[in-house]
């Protein structure tokens, strides 16, 4: 079968090979498309309800005044010339529609380095077949699930026209120290070959580099956190940041019900005071930041205290806020 590609809404003429140019003609067209369940036969003498979709012209060609999605399928003509010789024509018709130029909506004007950011949503309306959307960074294709790039896609079909609307939401994690003004664009690639891609206007968000937070220091007195029963332990939370953040205290991962203070004094230590302590500094701009954890323990008389105390890991770093 000869492959024919036709644009939706445009007329299409299919020639019936071997047909006499003028009536009387012995020919018939057979259609198997989205409008038929099996084969529909159209003849030159026809003329009727099918004329709005397909009709046989005086020269034997089949005329489709405005091709639609339902006209995709097989078209066959069988003609006999004046000498009785039979000729068959066979066409496979596929239809397409080029959408409007894609657009980036809900685009971000600023991205934060080191964390995932929504760049924007690319929208293409009115395509057939559906086609695909792809993103580009500085002209080069972005590959989803690589280097902090993720894409969420959605395809919808119009209930009446059958045309497709595509949406693609781009999330990226810009590298620290990278391009401060990256250029993003999106392009629509048609589902049928031989049609060039359509590209959006580019967007150029700024990349903001957050100032790295200096670590919250937890100082223990006595050093090492080992103390005789009845002794005193002083924990001091040192935060270089200005203005001074609020300091809260944790024991064994549970917040202590104390007012905010950079210093925690544990007088007359008893067994109930043993455990792992840390402080949490809450910055108005950065959120909470936890110190390393230190272990407070009681030394029975005659025991050697640990030289450097038992110090936990480096805490959770910057906590994610819900």
């Amino acid at each position: 079968a000869q492959n024919i590609t036709a644009r939706i809404g445009e007329p299409l003429v299919l020639k019936c090979k071997g047909a006499p140019k003028k009536p009387p003609q012995r020919l018939e067209w057979k259609l198997n498309t989205g409008r038929t369940e099996a084969w529909k036969v159209l003849s030159p003498q026809g003329g009727g309800p099918w004329d709005s979709v397909a009709r046989v012209l005086p020269n034997g060609s089949l005329f489709l005044p405005a091709v639609g999605i339902q006209d995709e399928g097989i078209f066959r003509c069988q003609a006999m010339n004046r000498n009785g010789k039979e000729t068959k024509s066979n066409y496979r018709v596929r239809v397409y529609q080029i959408p409007g130029k894609p657009e980036i909506v809900d685009s971000a004007s600023e991205l934060t380095a080191g964390v995932p950011n929504k760049v924007g949503t690319c929208v293409s309306e009115g395509s057939y077949p559906a086609g695909t959307l792809s993103w580009h960074l500085d002209g080069k294709p972005l590959v989803p699930n690589e280097k902090g790039v993720s894409v969420k896609e959605q395809t919808r079909r119009h209930p009446e026209t059958g045309l497709f609307t595509l949406q693609s939401e781009l999330m990226v994690t810009p590298a620290r120290g990278g391009d401060p003004r990256p250029t993003f664009s999106c392009s629509f690639s048609p589902g049928l070959p031989r049609h060039r891609a359509l590209r959006t206007a580019p967007i150029q968000p700024r990349v903001w580099e957050p100032v790295p937070l200096e670590e919250v220091q937890l100082v223990v007195e006595p050093e090492g956190g080992a103390v005789a029963p009845g002794g005193t332990v002083t924990l001091t939370c040192e935060v270089p940041a200005q203005p001074s953040p609020q300091i809260h205290w944790m024991k064994d991962g549970v917040p202590l019900p104390l007012p905010p203070s950079p210093v925690l004094i544990l007088p007359e230590i008893g067994p109930q005071d043993q455990g792992t302590y840390s402080c949490v500094a809450t910055h108005s701009s950065h959120g909470p930041q936890e110190s390393r954890a230190v272990s407070i323990s009681i030394i029975e008389p005659g025991e050697e205290g640990p030289t450097a105390g038992s110090v936990g890991g480096s805490g959770l770093g910057t906590l994610a806020l819900a």
Partner: antibody
Framework: EVQLVESGGGLVQPGSSLRLSCAAS????????MTWVRQAPGKGLEWVAS????????YYPDSVKDRFTISRDNAKNSLYLQMNSLRAEDTAVYYC????????????WGQGTLVTVSS | DIQMTQSPSSLSASVGDRVTITCRAS??????VNWFQQKPGKAPRRLIY???NLADGVPSRFSGSRSGTDFTLTISSLQPEDFATYYC?????????FGGGTKVEIK
């Protein structure tokens, strides 16, 4: 809202002529085929004529061919049926309906206008 | 020409009954069949298009089905306002042909 309003019916003598009109509103008239259907008193429905959206092609059953002519004026959103050589058996309520091709069938109908052919 | 043989020509039924009306085409008409309801002195109203699709604003108790050249209109639970005459129409070929009609009356 789609509306079709027929007019022009009445009592006429056999052999005479009558022109029916149908005023269409609420849709893009020139996107649709249009059709006339009739119903004799106490009887069923009978197709009378159809016309394509451009007005270039017209279709009739044998019972009215060469006597009736369907036409349209897309600028006026109007459909017409010119009936000549009227016979007693043409007595019926004449309905104007939207459609008539395979994409639509017949979806919206007017309220009808009565044509009586009698001496 | 295509004939559309509609049966029964009339039926008596009660509110709540399931009612089935059939049209048989004399040749293949594909899916190109409509069903209409007509009340006395009123224009026909389309119920079903392309054999099985419910027209806008039509209650879901109406449904259409097709098996080859047999087309069926079903009213799942007859309501008082459903007492009327019903017609099928084939629009695959000219002349467009209506069935003879089925009058649904109160038992």
């Amino acid at each position: 809202e789609v509306q079709l309003v027929e007019s022009g019916g009445g009592l006429v003598q056999p052999g005479s002529s009558l022109r029916l009109s149908c005023a269409a509103s609420g849709f893009t008239f020139n996107n649709y085929w249009m059709t006339w259907v009739r119903q004799a008193p106490g009887k069923g429905l009978e197709w009378v004529a159809s016309i394509d959206n451009s007005g270039d092609n017209t279709y009739y059953p044998d019972s009215v061919k060469d006597r009736f002519t369907i036409s349209r004026d897309n600028a006026k959103n109007s459909l017409y049926l010119q009936m000549n050589s009227l016979r007693a058996e043409d007595t019926a309520v004449y309905y104007c309906a939207r459609g008539g091709d395979i994409t639509t069938g017949l979806d919206y109908w007017g309220q009808g206008t009565l044509v009586t052919v009698s001496s | 020409d295509i004939q559309m043989t509609q049966s029964p020509s009339s039926l008596s039924a009660s509110v709540g009954d399931r009612v089935t009306i059939t049209c048989r085409a004399s040749q293949d008409v594909g899916i190109y069949v409509n069903w209409f309801q007509q009340k006395p002195g009123k224009a026909p109203r389309r119920l079903i298009y392309r054999a099985t699709n419910l027209a806008d604003g039509v209650p879901s108790r109406f449904s259409g089905s097709r098996s080859g050249t047999d087309f069926t209109l079903t009213i799942s639970s007859l309501q008082p306002e459903d007492f009327a005459t019903y017609y099928c129409l084939e629009f695959d070929e000219h002349p467009l042909t209506f069935g003879g009609g089925t009058k649904v009356e109160i038992k």
